[in-house]
């Protein structure tokens, strides 16, 4: 393994994870790990000086920049919170607020909005899709024979109650937000008026 | 010690428009969000908007995004709320604040305000 | 967006009194929540944080708490410095201030 600064002819660096190619001295120079920056650049006989990233500042990764990136606040304006603070070698983590969730572009969350969700009324339900969303939800009515009494989300259409596999005779008719109501039979040989 | 400084009044006349400024020292403005909020006289406290003074991002509440604009100044650690097109509605005390990496929820530091009066 | 209401909107208490000013966020804010003290011809002081935590330099008379929609600023033995008005601040998805408080000395 060559210790830096090093010649090389093809400019492609041993280790290029942690050393960069230098085209002024043509040598192949140590980059600076996390949570550090380069103090003084390589030259042909001394290898790259580095210093500590500044009070609220980071370089998260190995780099041979000559300044650290500003720590941000996590911005409460777009619904983010911090979950860990900004470090010499890590930007804070920002997460979204309970009842809020990402907004994605590029694969970054680069905000968060509240999730809205939509409640079908009683007689409805949601439509099934094959997507699983929570937002634009569809509502639709149940079906005949079927029925849904709460204002929820997810809630399915139920069958109505068939009294006579009971045993019972029907005493309300369902609707699509109510179930059937059944009751005992008459007692056989009692008089119907 | 974190500290804002505005300036005590300005006037201005209806149709035209002013610059607010908000020096801030012992911190770094590229650390922080500078937000602006408006006092009309004997009334509440209601949130305008703040920038990002490290991109120059900002956002505003749907009342103020034709009247404010912010900007900012790294080099001088320096943020600003031009209003325009005055009316004499716009007559408040305009305050600037920092979320900062220590508050980034609060608003611990404020600057002492600045009467704008909007008169002809 | 979500509201923030604050009652009374006037009140007037003796020294050594024990106060209670309510705001009410018009949909849950999961303890996101500040209060700030305002005196005449001064900019706004921040007093609690996060419902509950003081900030520093604020006397211990004051204490926050609340969760929900529901939240309570106590001053618990009032004090002559204490007449101002008193603001509370949601910072669940962005920043809003509610009406106000004024509080005076009997």
């Known amino acids: 393994q060559l210790v830096p600064p090093y010649r090389i002819e093809n400019q492609t660096c041993w280790d290029q994870d942690k050393e960069y190619y230098e085209p002024m001295h043509d040598v192949c120079c140590s980059r600076c790990p996390p949570g550090e920056f380069v103090f003084a650049v390589c030259s042909r006989s001394q290898d790259t000086v580095c210093k500590t990233c500044p009070h609220n500042s980071y370089n998260e990764h190995w780099n041979h920049l000559s300044t650290c990136q500003l720590c941000r606040p996590c911005d409460i304006v777009l619904g983010f919170e911090e979950v860990a603070p900004c470090t010499s070698d890590r930007k804070a983590e920002c997460r979204c607020q309970p009842g809020m969730s990402c907004v994605y572009l590029d694969n970054e969350c680069v905000h968060c909005e509240e999730e809205r969700l939509v409640l079908c009324q009683p007689g409805t339900e949601a439509e099934v899709t094959d997507e699983i969303m929570d937002t634009d939800v569809n509502c639709v009515p149940c079906k005949p024979g079927h029925f849904q009494n709460t204002s929820s989300p997810r809630a399915r259409c139920q069958p109505h109650t068939r009294c006579e596999i009971q045993g019972l005779v029907e005493a309300a008719p369902g609707t699509s937000y109510s179930d059937t109501i059944c009751k005992n039979p008459p007692e056989p040989g009692a008089m119907l008026l | 010690e974190v500290q804002l400084q505005q300036y005590g009044a300005e006037l201005g006349k209806p149709g035209t428009s002013v610059k607010l400024s908000c020096k801030v020292s012992?911190?770094?403005?590229?650390?922080?969000?500078i937000h602006w909020v408006i006092q009309r006289p004997g009334k509440g406290l209601e949130w305008i908007g703040r920038?990002?003074?490290?991109?120059?991002?900002?956002i505003c509440t749907e009342k103020f995004k034709n009247k404010a604009t912010l900007t900012a100044d790294l080099s001088s650690n320096t943020a600003y709320m031009q209003l325009s097109q005055l009316k004499s509605d716009d007559t408040a005390i305009y305050f600037c604040?920092?979320?900062?990496?220590?508050?980034?929820?609060?608003?611990?530091?404020w600057g002492q305000g600045t009467l704008v009066t909007v008169s002809s | 967006d979500i509201q923030m209401t604050q009652s009374p909107s006037q009140l007037s208490a003796s020294v050594g009194d024990r106060v209670t000013l309510s705001c009410k966020a018009s949909?849950?804010?999961?303890?996101?929540l500040n209060w700030y003290q305002q005196k005449l011809g001064e900019a706004p002081r921040l007093l609690i944080y996060s419902t509950n935590i003081l900030q520093t330099g604020i006397p211990s008379r004051f204490s926050g708490s609340g969760s929900g929609t529901d939240y309570t600023l106590t001053i618990s033995s009032l004090q002559p410095e204490d007449a101002a008005t008193y603001f509370c601040?949601?910072?669940?998805?962005?920043?809003?201030f509610g009406s106000g408080t004024k509080l005076e000395m009997k």
């Open positions: 949909q849950n804010i999961y303890k996101y």
């Open positions: 012992g911190y770094n403005i590229g650390n922080t969000y």
């Open positions: 601040q949601k910072y669940y998805s962005g920043f809003t």
């Open positions: 920038i990002d003074p490290t991109n120059g991002n900002t």
């Open positions: 604040a920092p979320t900062t990496l220590t508050t980034p929820d609060s608003f611990a530091y």
